[in-house]
């Protein structure tokens, strides 16, 4: 922690300027008034402070705003943002997308995924929902950041905004996030024709239920293997060999390459070997001929 000393009269600070780079840490602590610093935050980023000096300035702001910085200060943090922890950011109330853009630019190239995720979360809370302007800002300045949001936050995305989301924005989304986004996408794109619909819905299909995947198999969509591999295991297991063949079309040959990987491996184990043989791919591990298949999940549900 910085020692408290009194400020020498000749070192008194009346404005934030480049002369401060020559101040030692304890002089900055003693001579910079926190209220002055907050009022002139827009000047700080233009001054080549050392990281140690930035620590002092952060300490001053923390003392002045123990409940969290106001947005007027947050907007001008610049490289001081690199000093913020997720705990600091959690105290903020951010509504301006200009603030978000400024801080996303600063964070680029630095390992700040936790801080950025918390910042985006605060913006969504501050704005009340994940609206189109926010999504546009995220996709432009922080590809992949959409997936840093919790499923609870993503649930505030209106379906009308889904069209602004690009495939690469979903690359890092997990199943729980896609579970939230997929039904919104299905609603948003439902007025499109079959082929156009499939192109749009494809990046979201990791959240699709079995019946939607079955429906797609009737549409001659020729799903690529990469998309098939991202389908949830539970959505793939009930599909028949014929349905998978129709779903993948010419890409069905790719099943051989993915034979040992989930969900293909798990799906193979559920199929009759006779049925798998009809594909002519040499897939092995199906249920041998003559064996009886009991669907215990349905039996349990009925009991």
């Amino acid at each position: 922690d910085v020692e408290r000393t009194t400020c020498p009269p000749e070192k008194e600070v009346h404005e934030i300027d480049e002369s401060l780079i020559f101040y030692k840490k304890r002089e900055l602590e003693a001579c910079v008034d926190a209220a002055l610093l907050a009022a002139q935050m827009d000047r700080v980023d233009a001054i080549p402070f050392t990281y140690e000096q930035l620590d002092v300035l952060k300490h001053k702001l923390d003392e002045l705003y123990p409940q969290g910085y106001p947005e007027s200060v947050i907007r001008h943090l610049g490289h001081l943002f690199l000093k913020m922890s997720p705990e600091d950011i959690r105290k903020w109330n951010v509504t301006s997308l200009e603030t978000l853009k400024a801080l996303l630019k600063v964070s680029k190239g630095h390992e700040m995924s936790a801080q950025v995720a918390t910042l985006i979360d605060r913006v969504v809370v501050g704005r009340g929902q994940l609206d189109k302007d926010t999504v546009d800002t995220l996709t432009a300045f922080c590809p992949g950041c959409l997936c840093s949001l919790s499923p609870e936050r993503l649930s505030s995305v209106p379906p009308s905004v889904i069209g602004a989301v690009r495939p690469q924005d979903l690359d890092t989304c997990g199943p729980r996030q896609l579970d939230v986004l997929y039904p919104k996408a299905r609603l948003a794109f439902q007025n499109m024709s079959g082929s156009e619909y499939f192109v749009k819905i494809r990046p979201f299909l990791g959240g699709a239920p079995t019946e939607d995947v079955k429906a797609l198999s009737q549409q001659n969509v020729s799903m690529d293997l990469a998309t098939f591999m991202k389908l949830r295991r539970e959505a793939v297991l009930p599909l028949t060999v014929a349905e998978v063949q129709k779903l993948l079309g010419p890409h069905v040959e790719g099943l051989k390459v993915e034979e040992q990987h989930s969900p293909v491996r798990d799906w193979i184990l559920k199929q009759r070997q006779d049925d798998l043989d009809t594909l002519g791919l040499g897939l092995q591990g199906g249920i041998p001929n003559g064996y009886l298949i009991l669907d215990l999940s349905v039996r349990e549900a009925l009991s």
Partner: antibody
Framework: QVQLQESGPGLVKPSETLSLTCTVS????????WSWVRQPPGKGLEWIGY???????QSNPSLKSRVIISVDTSKNQFSLKLSSVTAADTAVYYC????????????????WGRGTLVTVSS | EIVMTQSPATLSVSPGERATLSCRAS??????LAWYQQKPGQAPRLLIY???TRATGIPARFSGSGSGTEFTLTISSLQSEDFAVYYC?????????FGQGTRLEIK
Amino acid sequence: QVQLQESGPGLVKPSETLSLTCTVSGGSIQNYYWSWVRQPPGKGLEWIGYIFYSGSTQSNPSLKSRVIISVDTSKNQFSLKLSSVTAADTAVYYCAREVGRIAVAGWFFDLWGRGTLVTVSS
Amino acid sequence: EIVMTQSPATLSVSPGERATLSCRASQSVNSNLAWYQQKPGQAPRLLIYGASTRATGIPARFSGSGSGTEFTLTISSLQSEDFAVYYCQQYNNWPLTFGQGTRLEIK
């Protein structure tokens, strides 16, 4: 074939929480989206919200602050909790299955439970 | 939210005649509209989806038309089992909303 059955108390006191369960039999709960819809006596239908087996939900904004929809895949059941009830929440509550077997599926219902009347009264 | 308005509230028609029920949306719902039939003490039954596609097992006398904001359900030749309450429902956006219903009664 798949059947739905609602269960829960038929009488709830004002300010308390209404709790209902829908049991899905004859098929897996994992294949579809599942909704709650209610109908006050002599009135029209109101969609409450849906749930996916993973727990992902969407609720009607008019009720959102009071609604919790949850799922128990091991029992093939999903549930509704509606807090701080008043007489205006007296209705027949239906669970329903959202259709998924259509090329570009829509949010409408091809299978319904028989419904259960819940009366809010002290 | 999208408000669905049905008219008339009650429609009296003789068996064998044609019945025409209307549903209007407060904003465009494209063709994302379903019709249901409900008899006393029973759950609703899906009749039509996509504004004009009959659900599985629904007789050909039921037909739907319209798009945007104006929709019609037509029953070409009323049978005794058709007298019930009919609801329209939009699924163009959340929250999903229903009309207040049209009661079809025997004249």
